[in-house]
């Protein structure tokens, strides 16, 4: 956990963060693990420590090895290890597996490819992006902040994407490249205006006084994972938590049930020991997502217990 693999290419900048995180006020000391020799903090050195960051400007194959960082608080010292490997630049276009960052997946609706590790560097936009070593051109490709957006993603967009940027340190510029694979999901998810399956609009629910009653608010929001989707109950236009009646509580039912591939949510309203005054309330089932909000209203009515005597009179 506190040993982290980092890699880079010779003659490029490489910045490594201590895998042992601490508060910003804590000091961090860096050492060569093999020799226990302290790494300097002076920026004139090619390899130097800067707080929780270890900087190779630029990196050399001989820098490969394990580095120790010790994070010091007033009362605790905690150790982390950075396993650094610097590789020679490849002459051909192939990016070997050991230089690849984690694979990301995209779909028609979400096709962002983040440039790995870029948050560690002092860089300025725009990023340059390459696919299989070819510079990306055309209106479908947009370099935005630290990621690439591909419009109208197709299965042919799968492949290895390399981002290239310049790190600036005290006026000196250093090149950095990072590559990751991009795969395209076949199944296209989508989002719809919420559809409330239950209760029906203006439904009248029969309840017995003194008994418990359950109302289920069930809605579907589209297909696949939804970024924002919620169902909830309101009483007389007020959230359940704010209404202040401990007998009436809501709890999540089935979370994101993918029956027929649809993303649906349930919220169950539990009314304990139904009272006369509960019949006067307006119960609203609300379903909302990025498209908007849909509301179905329910009212309660008294269910008269069967009077067995009157049947035989």
């Amino acid at each position: 956990k506190f040993s982290k693999q980092s890699w880079g290419l010779e003659n490029e900048a490489l910045i490594v963060r201590c895998p042992r995180q601490g508060k910003p006020s804590y000091t961090v000391d860096w050492y060569y693990s093999q020799t226990n020799k302290s790494i300097p903090t002076q920026e004139r050195n090619r390899v130097f420590a800067s707080g929780q960051l270890l900087k190779f400007l630029p990196a050399a194959v001989a820098d490969s090895g394990i580095y120790t960082c010790i994070v010091r608080s007033p009362t605790f010292n905690r150790t982390g290890y950075a396993n650094v490997t610097i590789y020679k630049k490849q002459s051909d276009c192939n990016v070997p597996d050991y230089l690849m960052y984690s694979t990301v997946s995209g779909s028609e609706k979400n096709s962002k490819i983040y440039c790995p590790t870029i948050d560690l560097y002092n860089w300025t936009a725009p990023l340059e992006w390459f696919k299989n070593c070819q510079a990306l051109q055309g209106s479908r490709y947009r370099a935005h902040k630290s990621f690439l957006v591909i419009d109208n993603v197709m299965t042919e967009d799968a492949g290895d994407y390399t981002c290239k940027f310049i790190h600036n340190e005290n006026g000196a510029n250093y090149s950095v490249t990072a590559t990751r694979s991009f795969t395209v999901k076949d199944e296209q998810g989508f989002s719809l205006f919420p559809v409330i399956g239950a209760p029906a609009q203006n439904e009248i629910k029969e309840v017995e006084i003194g008994k418990n009653a359950n109302l289920t608010c069930s809605a579907c929001f589209g297909k696949g994972t939804q970024f924002l989707a919620a169902v909830l109950w309101q009483l007389n236009g007020t959230k359940i938590t704010d209404f202040g009646e401990p007998r009436i509580q809501q709890e999540e039912g089935q979370n994101q049930s993918f029956s027929n591939g649809l993303a649906c949510l349930d919220m169950v309203l539990r009314i304990a020991d139904v009272k006369e005054e509960d019949l006067l309330l307006q119960y609203d089932c609300l379903a909302l997502n990025l498209h908007g909000l849909r509301r179905h209203t329910v009212r309660l009515s008294r269910k008269n217990p069967i009077d067995h005597h009157s049947i035989y009179c």
Partner: antibody
Framework: EVQLLESGGGLVQPGGSLRLSCAAS????????MFWVRQAPGKGLEWVSS????????YYADSVKGRFTISRDNSKNTLYLQMNSLRAEDTAVYYC????????????????WGQGTLVTVSS | EIVLTQSPATLSLSPGERATLSCRAS??????LAWYQQKPGQAPRLLIY???NRATGIPARFSGSGSGTDFTLTISSLEPEDFAVYYC?????????FGQGTKVEIK
């Protein structure tokens, strides 16, 4: 010197409520995560709840989820535990403790503890 | 939830003897393990953090070792004030959990 002082314990009936407080001093309260840990009579230690320094994230043991609420007032250097729907099995000494290191979403050890306050749930 | 199992439940030793307490995790906790000492009527006291580092003010006779799932707390030579209950705690993830404790008593 770091000090944590719990208060608010006592005898309460099942289904009742109590609010525990923990007054902190001797350190920068607002930057450290704080914990509630309990110990039933003659038993071991059980983590109850924790809250990050800015109050932005809270965590609960399954046994108290939905019944207990942890909160903090950094302007008063005070940690709270609101306990509702109390059960007999909640009977314990409740300790407040400091996590001196934790970063967002992670935990560390508890280096300072209060003396504890006894909560007894009984009819 | 990660379960920590301490053994033995009770350790009967004399002052000056060596105490070896064990803590086993149901899955790897790397080195995210601490040891605490608790005396009757008192709050727990932190002894060891990150499996092997002594907390500030803890005597050198206390040492911790181990990584992954198996951990040991060693008291090299028991002093009278060391007779207490010892707990291990993991903090690799939520929920943090404690072992059930080992009582070190005077033989």
């Amino acid at each position: 010197e770091v000090q944590l002082l719990e208060s608010g314990g006592g005898l309460v009936q099942p289904g009742g409520s109590l609010r525990l407080s923990c007054a902190a001093s001797g350190f920068t309260f607002s930057v450290d995560s704080m914990f509630w840990v309990r110990q039933a009579p003659g038993k071991g230690l059980e983590w109850v709840s924790s809250i990050e320094g800015n109050g932005g994230a809270t965590y609960y043991a399954d046994s108290v989820k939905g019944r207990f609420t942890i909160s903090r007032d950094n302007s008063k250097n005070t940690l709270y535990l609101q306990m509702n729907s109390l059960r007999a099995e909640d009977t314990a000494v409740y300790y407040c403790a400091r996590d001196p290191w934790s970063t967002e979403g992670s935990f560390f050890v508890l280096d300072y503890w209060g003396q504890g306050t006894l909560v007894t749930v009984s009819s | 939830e990660i379960v920590l199992t301490q053994s033995p439940a009770t350790l009967s030793l004399s002052p000056g003897e060596r105490a070896t307490l064990s803590c086993r995790a149901s899955q790897s906790v790397d080195d995210d393990l601490a040891w605490y000492q608790q005396k009757p009527g008192q709050a727990p006291r932190l002894l060891i953090y990150d499996a092997s580092n002594r907390a500030t003010g803890i005597p050198a006779r206390f040492s911790g070792s181990g990584s992954g799932t198996d951990f040991t707390l060693t008291i090299s030579s028991l002093e009278p004030e060391d007779f207490a209950v010892y707990y291990c705690q993991q903090y690799i993830g939520a929920p943090i959990t404690f072992g059930q404790g080992t009582k070190v008593e005077i033989k």
